[in-house]
Interface confidence: medium
Amino acid sequence: HKCDITLQEIIKTLNSLTEQKTLCTELTVTDIFAASKNTTEKETFCRAATVLRQFYSHHEKDTRCLGATAQQFHRHKQLIRFLKRLDRNLWGLAGLNSCPVKEANQSTLENFLERLKTIMREKYSKCSS
């Protein structure tokens, strides 16, 4: 069957996100992928969206992330804009209202996004073949 247009949009957004580092991509987030063996695909997407929402809600106006220069400021604003887009698309793909995120493990946002990109690319290769 054909790939969901949302999936393509997610991969595109993840590509943009992982291309550039900002002051806060080294901050840690809950690593939902560490123990996701008994988790459905929809739950994984929902939990990923929850983690991203927690991150941008907490750090959108974090002055450490906004930096001191115009370039740092705009890079961070762009990061937040992409995270919000990703969050919205993941919720659409998940089709769930809410999901618990209780893991103790942490990973950097950068690594979290790379892992999510790998998962999404695998899903895309399956649905496009």
């Epitope: 115009a70 370039q71 705009h74 762009q78």
Partner: nanobody, 116 residues
């Protein structure tokens, strides 16, 4: 031609207030985020505050949070910076900047000197 004209700077005592204005022309003001940026003597440029095109989204650098307020009047094509509780370290040339992806147009600046 894009023009940004700052005014309102001057000499003020520590603890005092100033209100900077920036009159914009040559572009559709309401379509752009705008920023105040400053350069202290012998230092590099640092952003002070940013406001979204509708005025509902604002950001402040740590060193001015709670003291400075950015605002805009799209009907007058004017950007403002209300500066309260001024300190000696706020002494700088303040520039307003048109902002879309980067601060791509600057005014000539207005000098703010905080001294007793």
């Amino acid at each position: 031609e894009v023009q940004l004209l700052e005014s309102g700077g001057g000499l003020v005592q520590p603890g005092g207030s100033l209100r900077l204005s920036c009159a914009a022309s040559g572009f559709t003001f309401r379509n752009y985020g705008m920023a105040w940026v400053r350069q202290a003597p012998g230092k590099g440029l640092e952003w002070v505050s940013w406001i979204g095109q509708y005025g509902d989204e604002t950001y402040y650098a740590d060193f001015v949070k709670g003291r400075f307020t950015i605002s805009r009047d799209n009907s007058k094509n004017t950007l403002y910076l209300q500066m309260n509780s001024l300190r000696a370290e706020d002494t700088a040339v303040y520039y307003c900047a048109k902002s879309l992806g980067r601060f791509d147009y600057w005014g000539q600046g207005t000098l703010v000197t905080v001294s007793s």
